[in-house]
């Protein structure tokens, strides 16, 4: 019980992480202009991994692609890449460990196999999660590099004469949705490893004895029983348990006269 | 067609209160901000503040502050300027307008007069 | 607060031929996220509300004449009437729509030679 309850809730840990991690990628504000001891300005900056955005006081929000590969910074590819495996990883760890879970009962898979799979989700889970907090944390550092830089120059301009602001960026929403959403699907995978301990097939080996009957000499030596043990726990009379698909669950806009999006 | 209306003409005293309205048709009044522009007889143009019509907020230029408050009633579409403690300098056109594209002030009122005299 | 200064004050031009007012502004007025630059162009004809001309420095409102023309980035900007008309006659003001406050230059009189 204990084991499915581990795998059940390392699943549910996961999915969210995932569904997080996918989230987190596609959001745009994984860096925001920061307000901080910033001239008052009537336009708002953010960017995404895929866009960035403007919204002006007026509500309107304009959002332009990168619509190029080889002019964007080797940073922002690195992290690119790392979501999208951390994605990936995740979703066919989600695959694996649906046919893993203890609850779902497929033709006639055995426990080892399930086991198996188990830790090959759980495996995928953590990397997954790993992929996620890394790309996120690379952001963040490209970020805090970036606001020192242009802290240190933040007026430029001919001899102070006319002045141009630099945009200052800080952490966006982003940021803390990949590292909560990268955390659950490491917690996840590691829910799952350790349900696969409780899985997997036991060989008990006895020595053989000797059983002495009236007259006869036969010698017993029993194989290796299969032992499912939950943790200990007595599973002689077993119960499969069909368990149901179970689902998880400002602004001023200004008319639009044109489509930029 | 975007329209906004605005209150008659004010005669007033130094020191008393005056209400001016922009009431406005022809689009979702939450979806525009509102600009008040205050322009002094054969003199330039001089932007007082907004009001977000959806929040509520207000933001008001550096010499509008105190005296002057923006207000809204979003079931009458309609904005206000409320001025009080009214001074001699005080008289001049006052003008809503919406802001656009590029916090551009899209729309105007027709402009309401406000005389200040003892 | 962001000062607007255009030149020339006012301006003298004959029917048909172009006429040019500059503006300019204390700081930079273009926004790094979209490369647009926040300045408006209005007119005001007397006895009249200004009227949207030109916003994000170049852009043309609808309904504007196409012989009106907006150009410049950063600091220094142009509104351009290809062909003066005489309806043109009016005040113009450019308007930082960047920062707040939102302030206007002074203003440029537009009559005909």
């Known amino acids: 019980m204990a084991v499915t309850a581990c795998q059940g809730l390392g699943f549910v840990v996961s999915l969210i992480g995932i569904a997080g991690i996918i989230a987190a990628t596609c959001m745009d504000q994984w860096s925001t202009q920061d307000l901080y001891n910033n001239p008052v300005t009537a336009v708002f900056n953010y960017q995404g991994l895929w866009r960035s955005c403007v919204r002006e006081s007026s509500g309107f929000t304009e959002c332009r692609g990168y619509f190029t590969l080889l002019g964007l910074p080797a940073m922002l590819q690195a992290v690119r890449a790392l979501m999208i495996v951390g994605i990936v990883l995740g979703a066919i760890g989600l695959l694996v460990s649906i046919f893993a879970l203890k609850c779902i009962r497929i033709g006639s898979m055995e426990d080892s196999a399930k086991a198996n799979m188990t830790l090959t989700s759980g495996i995928m889970f953590i990397v997954s999660g790993l992929c996620a907090i890394a790309g996120v944390s690379v952001f963040a550092n490209m970020l805090v590099t970036n606001f020192w830089m242009s802290t240190a120059n933040m007026y430029t301009g001919m001899g102070g004469m006319v002045q141009t602001v630099q945009t200052r960026y800080t952490f966006g929403a982003a940021l803390f949705v990949g590292w909560v959403a990268g955390g659950l699907t490491l917690i996840g995978g590691v829910m799952m490893c350790i349900a696969c301990r409780g899985l997997a097939p036991e060989e008990t080996n006895y020595k053989a004895v000797s059983y002495h009957a009236s007259g006869h000499s036969v010698a017993y030596k029993p194989g290796g029983f299969k032992a499912s043990t939950g943790f200990g726990s007595n599973t002689k009379n077993k119960k499969i348990y069909d368990g149901g698909a179970r689902t998880e669950d400002e602004v001023q806009s200004y008319p639009s006269k044109h489509d930029y999006v | 067609q975007v329209q906004l209306v605005q209150s008659g003409s004010e005669l007033k005293k130094p020191g008393e209160s005056v209400k001016v309205s922009c009431k406005a048709s022809?689009?979702?009044?939450?979806?525009?901000?509102m600009n008040w522009v205050r322009q002094a007889p054969g003199q330039g143009l001089e932007w007082m503040g907004w009001?977000?019509?959806?929040?509520?907020?207000?933001t008001y230029a550096d010499g509008f502050t105190g005296r002057f408050v923006f207000s809204m009633d979003t079931s009458a579409s309609t904005a206000y300027l409320q001025i009080s403690s009214l001074k001699a300098e005080d008289m001049a056109m006052y003008f809503c307008?919406?802001?656009?594209?590029?916090?551009?002030?899209?729309?105007w009122g027709q402009g309401t007069l406000v005389t200040v005299s003892s | 607060d962001i000062v607007m200064t255009q030149s020339p004050d006012s301006l003298a031009v004959s029917l048909g031929e172009r006429a040019t007012i500059n503006c300019k502004s204390s700081?930079?007025?273009?926004?790094?996220?979209?490369?647009?630059?926040?300045l408006t162009w209005y007119q005001q004809k007397p006895g009249q509300p200004p009227k949207l001309l030109i916003y994000?420095?170049?852009t043309r409102e609808s309904g504007v004449p196409d012989r009106f023309s907006g150009s410049g980035s950063g600091t220094d900007f142009t509104l351009t009437i290809s062909s003066l008309q005489a309806e043109d006659v009016a005040v113009y003001y450019c308007?930082?729509?960047?920062?707040?406050?939102?302030?206007f230059g002074q203003g440029t009189k537009l009559e005909i030679k």
């Open positions: 307008a919406t802001l656009g594209y590029g916090n551009s002030l899209a729309y």
């Open positions: 022809g689009y979702t009044f939450t979806n525009y901000g």
């Open positions: 009001i977000n019509t959806y929040t509520g907020e207000s």
């Open positions: 700081q930079s007025l273009l926004n790094s996220g979209n490369q647009r630059n926040y």
């Open positions: 994000w420095a170049s």
């Open positions: 308007q930082n729509n960047y920062f707040y406050p939102f302030t």
